[in-house]
C-alpha cells in the first residue's frame, strides 16, 4: 500500500513539475526590467526565452520572437536546449510511468517489468528536473553578470551632455516557476526511485535442497534473482516545443487602439 | 466614435476648489488611462499627469503633487480633476487626454476654462 | 525631468514649401526592448484642443494626412510637412512619452510666409 501511494505520489509530483517546466519554458517573463533605482520609465521591458515584450503604461504590449538562430547568444540556446531536453525526459518519464503505475493492471505485466519501469521513469524524471534546474540557473547567471556589467556604466553620454539610460533586467517570475517545477520533477523521481525497490519482487523462496558432500553438511540456498533494470524504451525523443516564436512581425496584445488592465 | 466631454467654465475665487469633470463614450471606460494636461493663457502645454481608471492609482508631474487630485467614477465612465486652494496662477485651460499607443496622447476632451480671479 | 527644447520658436514657410521643425531630449528616448523612441507630435490650431500627429517618433496616427513625417531617433527629431497647406498653420509640440513626466517641447508656431 505504502509502494502504491509512493509511486503515486512521486508521479503526481513529476507531473506538476513537468507542467510547471513547460510553463516557465513558454513564458515570456524569464528577465524583467529592474524598476529599484531606476528613472521611472512609462514602458516596462520583459524578456523570454523566445520573445522580448514591451508594456506601455497605456497598457499596449508589443512582443517580438527571437526571428534569428545564429545571432543569439550561446548561453540562450544553451538555455532552450536544457529546458527542451528537460521536457522530453520529462514526457517520456510521464509515458512511462503512466504504464508502471502499480494500480494500473497491463495485460499479464510482471512486478519485476513494473519496477523497471519506475526506476526507468523516476531516472527520467530526476535528470529533466537537473536540466530544467540548471537552465535557469545558468540564465539566472547571465542576468546576475549582465546585471553588474551594466550598473558598472548605468549612464553612458556624450561629455554628460545627453545621457541614455541602460535598461537592466533581474530575475523575472519564470526563473522561480522553473527552479520550483525543477525541484518538483526531481522529488518525484526520487520517489519514483524509491518506489521501485518496494515494487521489485521479494527472493524467490525455493525448498532449499541439501547436498551432502563427505565430512561436511552444506546447505545451499539458491539467492532471489532480481530483475535486469535495463528497460528498453525505443520511444523516440520529438520535440515537443516548437520555440514559441511567432510569425508576424510584431504582436500586438488586442484589437483596439488601447487597451490596459 | 471615442469621445471626451468636459464640463463648462468656471470662475473662482483664490483659496476655493473646483472639480473639472471628463466624461467619455464610445469605448470601455477602463481600458484607457486618463491624462490631464494645463494650458495657461498664451503658454504652452503641461502635463499634469494620469490616472489608471482600472486601478485608480494616479501619476503626478512634480508641481502637481498636493492641491491637484486625480479621480475616476467608472458606473459614470467621468474622469475627475479636483484643485483645492485655487491661486491666480492656475487660471488656465485644462484638458483631459486618453492615452494611446506609444503612450500618447491620443484623444482629447474639448478643455475646460479655469478662471480664478478676486 | 527630461527637458524638451523645440526649434525654430516660430517658422514661416511658404504655401506649398517644406517646413522642418525640430525637437531635442535631455535624454535618450530610444527604448532598447522594442527598439522604439517614445516621441510624439501634436498640432494645435487655436481655441482648439492638440491633435496627435505621430507617435513612436515615426508613426503617423490615422487621419492624418502623409505630408506629415516624423524621424530621428536618441534625442534628436524631427517633424516634417512636405507641401504646406493654409490649413497646417498652428502650434506644433513634441512630447516625451517615455519617461514620467511627459514633458512636452515649448512649441512652434507655424505661419504661412
Known amino acids: 500500500m505504502a509502494v502504491t501511494a509512493c509511486q503515486g505520489l512521486g508521479f503526481v509530483v513529476s507531473l506538476i513539475g513537468i507542467a510547471g517546466i513547460i510553463a516557465a519554458t513558454c513564458m515570456d517573463q524569464w528577465s524583467t526590467q529592474d524598476l529599484y533605482n531606476n528613472p521611472v520609465t512609462a514602458v516596462f521591458n520583459y524578456q523570454g526565452l523566445w520573445r522580448s515584450c514591451v508594456r506601455e503604461s497605456s497598457g499596449f504590449t508589443e512582443c517580438r520572437g527571437y526571428f534569428t538562430l545564429l545571432g543569439l547568444p550561446a548561453m540562450l540556446q544553451a538555455v532552450r536546449a536544457l529546458m527542451i531536453v528537460g521536457i522530453v525526459l520529462g514526457a517520456i518519464g510521464l509515458l512511462v510511468s503512466i504504464f508502471a503505475l502499480k494500480c494500473i493492471r497491463i495485460g499479464s505485466m510482471e512486478d519485476s517489468a513494473k519496477a523497471n519501469m519506475t526506476l526507468t521513469s523516476g531516472i527520467m524524471f530526476i535528470v529533466s528536473g537537473l536540466c530544467a534546474i540548471a537552465g535557469v540557473s545558468v540564465f539566472a547567471n547571465m542576468l546576475v553578470t549582465n546585471f553588474w556589467m551594466s550598473t558598472a556604466n548605468m549612464y553612458t553620454g556624450m561629455g554628460g551632455m545627453v545621457q541614455t539610460v541602460q535598461t537592466r533586467y533581474t530575475f523575472g517570475a519564470a526563473l522561480f516557476v522553473g527552479w520550483v517545477a525543477g525541484g518538483l520533477t526531481l522529488i518525484g523521481g526520487v520517489m519514483m526511485c524509491i518506489a521501485c525497490r518496494g515494487l521489485a519482487p521479494e527472493e524467490t523462496n525455493y525448498k532449499a535442497v541439501s547436498y551432502h558432500a563427505s565430512g561436511h553438511s552444506v546447505a545451499y540456498k539458491p539467492g532471489g534473482f532480481k530483475a535486469s533494470t535495463g528497460f528498453g524504451s525505443n520511444t523516440k525523443n520529438k520535440k515537443i516545443y516548437d520555440g514559441g516564436a511567432r510569425t508576424e512581425d510584431e504582436v500586438q496584445s488586442y484589437p483596439s487602439k488601447h487597451d490596459y488592465v | 466614435q471615442i469621445q471626451l466631454v468636459q464640463s463648462g467654465s468656471e470662475l473662482k475665487k483664490p483659496g476655493e476648489s473646483v472639480k473639472v469633470s471628463c466624461k467619455a463614450s464610445?469605448?470601455?471606460?477602463?481600458?484607457?488611462?486618463m491624462n490631464w494636461v494645463r494650458q495657461a493663457p498664451g503658454q504652452g502645454l503641461e502635463w499634469m499627469g494620469w490616472?489608471?481608471?482600472?486601478?485608480?492609482?494616479?501619476t503626478y508631474a512634480d508641481g502637481f503633487t498636493g492641491r491637484f487630485v486625480f479621480s475616476s467614477d467608472t458606473s459614470a465612465r467621468t474622469a475627475y480633476l479636483q484643485i483645492s486652494s485655487l491661486k491666480a496662477e492656475d487660471t488656465a485651460v485644462y484638458f483631459c487626454a486618453t492615452l494611446g499607443y506609444g503612450n500618447s496622447l491620443a484623444y482629447w476632451g474639448q478643455g475646460t476654462l479655469v478662471t480664478v480671479s478676486s | 525631468d527630461i527637458v524638451m527644447t523645440q526649434s525654430p520658436d516660430s517658422l514661416a514657410v511658404s504655401l506649398g514649401e517644406r517646413a522642418t521643425i525640430n525637437c531635442k531630449s535631455s535624454?535618450?528616448?530610444?527604448?532598447?526592448?522594442?527598439?522604439?523612441?517614445?516621441l510624439t507630435w501634436y498640432q494645435q490650431k487655436p481655441g482648439q484642443p492638440p491633435k496627435l500627429l505621430i507617435y513612436w517618433a515615426s508613426t503617423r496616427e490615422s487621419g492624418v494626412p502623409d505630408r506629415f513625417s516624423g524621424s530621428g531617433s536618441g534625442t534628436d527629431f524631427t517633424l516634417t510637412i512636405s507641401s504646406l497647406q493654409a490649413e497646417d498653420v498652428a502650434v506644433y509640440y513634441c512630447?516625451?512619452?517615455?519617461?514620467?513626466?511627459?514633458?512636452f517641447g515649448q512649441g512652434t508656431k507655424l505661419e504661412i510666409k
Open positions: 512630447q516625451n512619452n517615455y519617461f514620467y513626466p511627459f514633458t
Open positions: 535624454q535618450s528616448l530610444l527604448n532598447s526592448g522594442n527598439q522604439r523612441n517614445y
Open positions: 490616472i489608471n481608471t482600472y486601478t485608480g492609482e494616479s
Open positions: 464610445g469605448y470601455t471606460f477602463t481600458n484607457y488611462g
